[in-house]
């Protein structure tokens, strides 16, 4: 008796597909061992057709896959474009050889069934319409025309030419003739449902001279498309319902027993479980739209349906499209914290993952907005200048090659709280959703800059100091000059970090930046920050104004370490960096297949596309190394 379980018999028809699930006992060894699907020959030998090691036989090339779901203790074999040659005995199993644990599966593929020659078959999808053609002889032209549906005992009238209509077809059935052709009438039935499927007879005339035609109407539920996605990745449901519903409200819902619960629709309804990680995007005037869900969770797996109806809710007899979404917990997308906490006046450093194989891809950060259908305007990107309202407080640091880029936002206010997406123009699965929570500051900031009101005088020397607590002693301190293309890190040496002193004097820990001599280009925002390797931590910002010396006044340059800045920015260390050990991550967002879509979804203004260096030190037009001298007091 095998511990592997699956379907003993599978039957289908030519051209169709099968999805065979095999269940295995819940052990670590089983979860990680090779899975296979083999065909049994007359000799008893079982020839591998596909395995989880990546093997794919020639006869399955391009039409089969095998996917392991270790969290469910199952694996699935999908085979498409079936032919009668696929009929046979198979095994699904586990183990390094095909003699391991296995289960016997019999697959039978038959020809498409044929109906009697006098029956006309119409095959339509749910929600669509059908026009049945009913020919008749000229002598029956003046006679009554009708269509009836066969039941066990009789044939129940659907519609006739005297305008009698069955109550269940009112508003859906029309009997008509085209032009001057007196040898054929037509019956159109719209908003087809499963109940409309069956055998019909159309008739012209009565008695033995009547013209009759048998019709078999097949109403199909759309075959669900199988979608396999990784945990924390994103999924796009591309819904194409046709021009006839182009002006109706659109929805995406998830099946729950026999109801379908709306997740999002174009009338503004949205399931709270998807807050911050879903967008619905009308594509064109042909009834096409897409729904993007990011940061996939285990519980997002299930059966989804998209449709259109003026109510924005599922209605029988309206066109639908369906998917079955599987969420694989063996994800390549790193597990990162989904909630980042900051305080008013403070800063956050958000580490955004991207596919390390695509280090040259363009990186973006956008803010999810739930109004309307939802959109995500880009705030900053490697070739998108920082939005004006974020001047001096937002920058993107690209660290090519290591699979992470960092977005820093400082001078936080409670209005910054919300959902943000990390995304690239590359692999669309790597989209992360971050929820930023901003609490009111309750204590002094960790980093403080003096002087607070910084006005430098042209041609003179100007020094600003950044005070930091002892807990940052071992971290790298830096100053950078902010521009809307990034924050250019200025050359520095941190003498304090190299001192082998064990003690730390809280009052004397500071890193200074000196502008000598001050030029007009030095005006702008400067950031003082801490980082450890490529992991960025807290920052604080200061605006340095540059003015010409006024005659008769001598400019005092305050560098007194006790002149503490009261507006300096604060952030709790535990929450400021996204790289901490205890991060309990999840989401990762997902839309935008290409750059243009980022614009479309985010309603991006043209100026956002301006090119430029986004925070890497080598793209700056002006080198500051000769001017900016950093030293430690």
């Amino acid at each position: 008796k095998s511990p592997i379980f699956g379907p003993q018999e599978v039957s289908s028809i030519e051209g169709d597909s099968v999805s065979i699930t095999c269940y295995y006992p819940d052990t670590s060894v089983n979860r990680h061992t090779r899975k296979y699907w083999c065909r049994q020959g007359a000799s008893g030998m079982c020839t591998t057709l596909i395995s989880s090691n990546g093997y794919l036989s020639k006869e399955y090339s391009g039409r089969a896959n095998l996917i392991n779901f270790p969290e469910n203790n199952t694996f699935v074999i999908n085979i498409e474009q079936l032919t009668q040659d696929d009929t046979g005995s198979y095994k699904c199993g586990l183990g390094t050889s095909n003699r391991g644990l296995s289960f016997d599966v019999s697959l039978e593929v038959s020809q498409v069934p044929e109906l009697p020659s006098d029956t006309h078959v119409y095959t339509k999808d749910i929600g669509r319409n059908v026009t049945i053609e009913c020919p008749f002889k000229r002598e029956n032209a003046p006679s009554k025309k009708s269509l009836c549906k066969k039941t066990n005992q009789s044939c129940e009238l659907v519609i006739d030419s005297t305008e009698k209509v069955n109550p269940s077809y009112i508003g859906r059935a029309k009997l008509f003739m085209k032009g001057t052709d007196l040898t054929v009438f037509y019956v159109n039935i719209s908003h087809l449902t499963h109940n409309d499927a069956g055998l019909y007879i159309c008739q012209a005339g009565e008695g033995p001279s009547a013209d009759k035609k048998n019709v078999d109407l097949q109403v199909l539920a759309p075959e669900p498309e199988l979608l396999y996605k990784d945990l924390r990745s994103s999924v796009t449901f591309e819904c194409d319902l046709g021009r006839e519903v182009a002006n109706e409200a659109k929805y995406l819902c998830r099946m729950n027993k026999e109801t379908c619960d709306v997740i999002i629709n174009t009338l503004g309804k949205r399931d709270p479980d998807f807050e911050g990680r879903i967008l619905i995007t009308p594509k064109d005037d042909n009834g096409r739209f897409s729904v993007l869900i990011t940061g996939l969770r285990k519980e997002d797996a299930g059966h989804y349906q998209c449709g259109a109806h003026s109510s924005g809710l599922p209605q029988e007899g309206w066109p639908i499209q369906t998917w079955q979404l599987f969420v694989n917990e063996e994800s390549t997308i790193p597990n990162r914290r989904s909630v980042v906490k900051g305080v008013t006046g403070g800063s956050v450093a958000i580490a955004c993952p991207y596919n390390p194989k695509e280090s040259s891809s363009l990186k973006y950060w956008c803010r999810w907005e739930g109004d309307g259908n939802g959109h995500c305007p880009v705030l900053v990107g490697t070739q998108a200048q920082v939005q004006e309202e974020y001047e001096g407080r937002l920058a993107l640091f690209d660290q090519p090659g290591n699979g992470t880029y960092t977005v820093i936002l400082n001078q936080l206010t409670t209005e910054d709280a919300g959902f943000y997406w990390c995304l690239t123009n590359g692999d669309s699965r790597w989209r992360t959703t971050i929820e930023l929570q901003v609490a009111e500051a309750t204590r002094e900031p960790n980093l403080e800059v003096t002087p607070q009101n910084a006005t430098a005088v042209l041609g003179e020397t100007f020094t600003v100091s950044c005070h930091y607590p002892c807990k940052f002693y071992s971290q790298e301190k830096y100053w950078c000059k902010w521009s809307n293309k990034g924050c250019h890190i200025l050359p520095s040496h941190d003498e304090g970090a190299r001192q082998s002193s064990v003690s730390c004097d809280q009052s004397s820990q500071l890193v200074s930046m000196t502008l000598n001599p001050v030029s007009k280009e030095d005006e702008g925002w400067y950031w003082c920050g801490v980082k450890q390797g490529q992991t960025y931590g807290e920052t604080t910002a200061i605006y340095i104004a540059v003015e010409e010396r006024t005659r008769g006044s001598s400019h005092v340059n305050p560098t007194d370490a006790n002149a503490r800045a009261k507006v300096a920015l604060e952030e709790e260390v535990v929450d400021s960096s996204i790289s901490e050990k205890e991060n309990k991550a999840i989401p990762n967002p997902g839309p935008f297949a290409n750059e243009r879509e980022i614009q479309n979804v985010g309603d991006q203004a043209q100026e956002n596309r301006a090119s430029g260096d986004a925070g890497s030190a080598d793209g700056q037009s002006r080198s500051s190394s000769s001017k900016h001298h950093h030293h430690h007091h």
Epitope: P7, E9, S11, S12, D16, T193, N195, A221, M255, Q305
Partner: nanobody
Framework: QVQLVESGGGLVQAGGSLRLSCAAS????????MGWFRQAPGKEREFVAA??????????YYADSVKGRFTISRENAKNTVSLQMNSLKPEDTAVYYC????????????????????WGQGTLVTVSS
């Protein structure tokens, strides 16, 4: 709401046959799963057989104890599922329950009772030796 009605139970001698039927009221399921479970006196309810379908594709599942003796089948137009039971044994004596899941695609392990949304009242099968 879908209602399931079982029929065909009764008394039969060991080695004999019975055919159980389960009729689902309401509209035809375009895809889904129907199964048979049984509960012998003083024992837990256990899986017997199941059938899943979507479009023209059908999947049949059997418990090891009934493999080769029982056959599950479905009549699409009538919305019914049947269980043909041959070579019956005294240990097959139980109340047989029909269960159904109406869904776009049938979900998890068909042996799990939580996989089914609707249940019938049961029909008693007694196999005498």
């Amino acid at each position: 709401q879908v209602q399931l009605v079982e029929s065909g139970g009764g008394l039969v001698q060991a080695g004999g046959s019975l055919r159980l039927s389960c009729a689902a009221s309401g509209r035809a399921f375009s895809s889904g799963r129907m199964g048979w479970f049984r509960q012998a006196p003083g024992k837990e309810r256990e899986f017997v057989a199941a059938i899943s379908w979507s479009g023209h594709t059908t999947y049949k599942y059997y418990a090891d104890s009934v493999k080769g003796r029982f056959t599950i089948s479905r009549e699409n137009a009538k919305n019914t599922v049947s269980l043909q039971m041959n070579s019956l044994k005294p240990e097959d004596t139980a109340v047989y329950y029909c269960a159904a899941r109406q869904s776009l695609v049938a979900g998890g392990d068909p042996r799990g009772q939580s996989e089914y949304d609707y249940w019938g009242q049961g029909t008693l099968v007694t196999v005498s030796s």
